[in-house]
Every structure is written in C-alpha cells, then in structure tokens.
C-alpha cells in the first residue's frame, strides 16, 4: 500500500507528511489505524493533525505505530499510511542506522549536504552542524539556508553529520536533529563559463495578448556536479521578486543532466494574461558561476 | 456536468499533419491534467500524451515523441494535440480525458472522457 | 515501461455468474492501479481506483482487490450491462500504460 516510514526522537518535534499528495484545497482526515481513532486538529494537542502535515510536539515513544491519512477530492478519497517510529534519545554519541536519513556523496567541487525533512518545519536559520557528534567550528564550514556547505573537500570529510533546528509553533519551540551520512567521491568534472543555450541573444518572441506565455532561460555550465551555477530572469535589470507584478512568476531551476555529461540548468519565466505593458520590458536571461556572468536579452512583440 | 468533445479527425496522408481539439465544459479547465488516449481499430487503449495543470510539463509515449505536440488554451478551455509527420500505425480513435487528481510529477485515473474522434492515416 | 499483462483474454459467462478477471504488472505499482469498462462504440468508463475503490455511481458488485504486481477485478453476479472490455491501467509513472483487455462475453 501507499506508505511511508517516517522516525524521530523522543521530546522532538516530528512532522510528517501523508504520503499520498493532493492539492492544497483537498480535505485530509487522518487516523490512528490501531484504533481506526480519528486525529485531532486542535492544536492544542501535542498530537494533532494540520491539512497533510500530522504533527508530534514533542513526540513521545508511545507514538510509534502506523497513522492512516485519506485524502478527500469532490469526487475521489485516496487513503495513504504513515509508519511513524520514535525512539528513545541515545546516551552516547553513536547514531543507529535505524535513524540515518539517505547518504549523499560530495566532490571537491560539490559538497552541499542538505538538512532531511527540514522543509516541514517552521525553522529559522542558521542550522546547527555536526559532524560525528562534534560542533562544526571553522571557516570552511558554511551553514547556508537549509543545507551545509564545506570547503575544499577531503576524503576525511566523510562520516555522519547532524543537523539542529529549531521548530516554532505557536510561540513554542521544540528541538529537531537529523543525521545522514556524506561520502566522498573523486569526481572528474569541470566547470566552464556559462553557455546560454537559449533564448538566443536579442531574441524576439511573438506572444498574443490576453494569452499565456512561457520563456525559458537555460545554460550549461560544464559537466559533473556545479559547486554554483544559477539561471535566473530580470526585467528591465531587476529581480523578479522586486518586480511586483504577481502574473509574471519565475519557476525555481531545474536542473539538466544530459547524455554527454553537461551539466544545465533551467529556469522557466511565466507571464499570464500578456498585456500590452509587457512588450515594452527587457526580458534578460542571466547565468552565473564562478567563472562569471552571461547575459541574453529577448523581447517581446505582438503576433 | 462535465463533458469532453474532440474534433478535428479525419482521413490524412502518411507524413501529413492534423490538429485535433477537445473543448471542455463544467469544469475548473485550468487545473487539472489533460490526456490524449488513442485506441486502434479493433485494439487495446494506448497512451499518448499528458499535460499537467497549471501550466505544467508534458509527457509522450515514446511512439509519437517528437512527432506529436499536446497544449492547451486555459481561457478556452481547450486541449490540443499536433500531429505532424503520420503514419499509418497513428490511424486510431483518439480519445480526450481528464485526470482528476493532478498534483506536481504524478498521475491518476482519467475519469472523464470524450465520445473520440477518429484519425485515419492512408494513401 | 511497465507492462500489464490480463487474463484471460476471453471470458465466456452467463448472466448471474461471478467473472473474475486478472491483471499483473511487471514491476510493483504499489495500489496505483486502475480498472474500466468499455462497451463497443463508447468511450471507457472509470471502475475502480487505487486498486479497490469504486469510483462514484459504480455499483457494488464491482469490486478491486491486489497490491505490488497482481491485481483482481470482480464481477459477484454479471448483470446483461456488464458483458464488456474491461482494461487495467497503471499510473504510478509515465508511460501510463493500459492492459490488453479482457473480453467478457455472454456464454
């Protein structure tokens, strides 16, 4: 069946997600299968559910045990299954593999370790490192967003490392640790300046106003892993998020991965209901990495 | 009532091009997934295309892959499906549906479909 | 891609009789499995979903039952209306793919 495991930490918040994803307006109940006993949504409780999330604050070893969550469209429920499992907090500094998130693999040019499951909580920065139990101390360690950043890795950077954040809910805080395992691999990849694939420099695209246009902005970089390479859209010189004009959205990149190794990326700009003001802005396609700055402008011109 | 209607089939030569259209109805068009089903004379229902939602990416079966174009107009509540360079293995019903559920990179059932049209690739 | 592969191809039975039709996939779908009906000339019509839901206005002689790779659709006493194809599909991945169909027809 439909079903996910999910762990955590005695007296830590542990937030799970139903399994089986549905729009943000569908209605999900969730159960405690054992008991078929539906799940609060007051958060009052220190269990209690809240839309797909099921949150334990703090989670208690009682807990353990498969959640039942049923997804409810107008016209279709779709039943998912939690099997939550909270143990108790070791006494030493040894981390089971029972509470090891996936292992990720760094190079000397990429070495982003990234906090498990963070995404579901209300955090604020900076995380908390550790490897192998120790504080990250040091200016090669740098705690960035939601993931650790190491500098001029070496093979002995390898081992567990823990990450700590705090979750806010409702003015009270709760602890949160996750560990996963970073390897380290030799990889023989380069980094070139970035090659704007598209759209062609001084480009003119043709939209219908009234209609719905995408622009996509893609770049390579090199091939391997990217220590950095970003694609991002500007209008008239300014960001995005700068420019308040909520029908014109920027997806977040995706990244390209193709047959003979490049390493690209994708960055798609979404204008709904093109107006006439638009086909007056500047439309610049902008890739960055270490090596530097490219930059493709287009336009835009009614069919 | 939702409802689903195709159109633009007919008799074609190999290698030609057709635009078929399926209008829809009684439906919220814009958010959810639209899918292109074709079914050959006297066989099985083959796959052919999905669009997702909200402007979302396409996927193809690998037998029309970089023949065939599915899109959509959201203030006209219509799905496309560009056909160029056919064959005759493309000669089917092709049916329009929708998938119900439709949230980010998975599928579901198709639970509405159109009555079909019919594209026949001959000489 | 994920292949479905039903069975029988044909099902010879008679009005109030139980038909029991198969459909196994070649790899784990988990319950994302789908089953419909379709009648000569018209389009399919959504059965069951997620392997053993029915879908909304679907009797309840029709049932669905499986999960991974072997999947059952099952007819507890066929009705005249239910002599039909019926189709498997699978949507955990694209390529969505669809069985062969199964024939039942009236004995």
């Known amino acids: 069946k439909f079903s996910k495991q999910s762990w955590g930490l005695e007296n830590e918040a542990l937030i799970v997600r139903c399994p089986r994803q549905g729009k943000s307006s569908y209605i999900v109940d969730w159960y405690y299968s054992q008991t078929n006993k539906s799940i609060p949504t007051q958060e009052r409780n220190r269990v209690f559910a809240s839309g797909q999330l099921l949150k334990f604050l703090p989670a208690e070893v009682a807990d353990s045990g498969i959640y039942t969550c049923i997804v409810r469209s107008p016209t279709f429920n779709r039943t998912g299954y939690a099997n939550v499992t909270i143990y108790k907090k070791q006494p030493d500094c040894n981390v089971p593999d029972y509470l090891m998130y996936s292992t990720v693999s760094g190079s000397e040019k990429n070495s982003k370790i990234y906090c498990p499951t963070i995404d579901l909580y209300n955090w604020t920065a900076p995380l908390e490192w550790f490897k192998n139990c120790q504080a990250l101390q040091g200016s090669r360690y740098k705690a960035h967003k939601s993931f650790l950043v190491i500098d001029n890795v070496m093979t002995d950077d390898a081992g567990d490392y823990t990450c700590k954040f705090i979750h806010n809910e409702n003015g009270a805080n709760y602890s949160v640790t996750a560990t996963r395992s970073f390897t380290v691999k030799d990889e023989q990849g380069f980094s070139l300046f970035p090659v704007i694939r598209a759209p062609a420099h001084n480009e003119t695209k043709e939209v219908e106003i009234g209609e719905n246009t995408n622009l996509t902005c893609s770049a390579c970089f090199g091939k391997g892993a990217q220590f950095l390479a970003t694609v991002q859209w500007q209008l008239n010189g300014n960001k995005i998020t700068d420019f308040s004009e909520p029908r014109i959205q920027q997806e977040e990149g995706q990244n390209q991965s193709f047959s003979n190794g490049l390493a690209c990326v994708n960055t798609v700009l979404r204008i709904a209901d093109v107006k006439e003001e638009d086909l007056l802005l500047r439309y610049d396609c902008l890739a960055l990495n270490l090596h530097g700055l490219r930059r493709h402008t287009i336009r835009l011109s009614r069919k | 009532e939702v409802q689903l209607l195709e159109s633009g089939g007919g008799l074609v030569q190999p290698g030609g091009s057709l635009r078929l259209s399926c209008a829809a109805s009684?439906?919220?068009?814009?958010?959810?997934?639209m899918i292109w089903v074709r079914q050959a004379p006297g066989k099985g229902l083959e796959w052919v295309s999905t669009?997702?939602?909200?402007?979302?990416?396409?996927y193809y079966a690998d037998s029309v892959k970089g023949r065939f174009t599915i899109s959509r107009d959201n203030s006209k509540n219509t799905l496309y499906l560009q056909m160029n360079s056919l064959r005759a293995e493309d000669t089917a019903v092709y049916y329009c549906?929708?998938?119900?559920?439709?949230?980010?990179?998975?599928?579901?059932?198709?639970?509405?479909w159109g009555q079909g049209t019919l594209v026949t690739v001959s000489s | 891609e994920i292949v479905l592969t039903q069975s029988p191809a044909t099902l010879s039975l008679s009005p109030g009789e139980r038909a029991t039709l198969s459909c196994r996939a070649s790899q784990s779908v988990d319950d994302d499995l789908a089953w419909y009906q379709q009648k000569p000339g018209q389009a399919p019509r959504l059965l069951i979903y997620?392997?053993?839901n029915r879908a909304t206005g679907i009797p309840a002689r029709f049932s669905g039952s499986g999960s991974g790779t072997d999947f059952t659709l099952t007819i507890s006493s066929l009705e005249p209306e239910d002599f039909a194809v019926y189709y498997c599909?699978?949507?955990?991945?694209?390529?969505?793919?669809f069985g062969q169909g199964t024939k039942v027809e009236i004995k």
């Open positions: 009684g439906f919220t068009f814009s958010i959810y997934d």
């Open positions: 669009i997702k939602g909200e402007g979302g990416g396409t």
């Open positions: 997620d392997a053993s």
């Open positions: 599909q699978q949507y955990i991945t694209a390529p969505l793919t």
């Open positions: 549906a929708r998938d119900p559920w439709s949230t980010e990179g998975s599928f579901f059932v198709l639970d509405y």
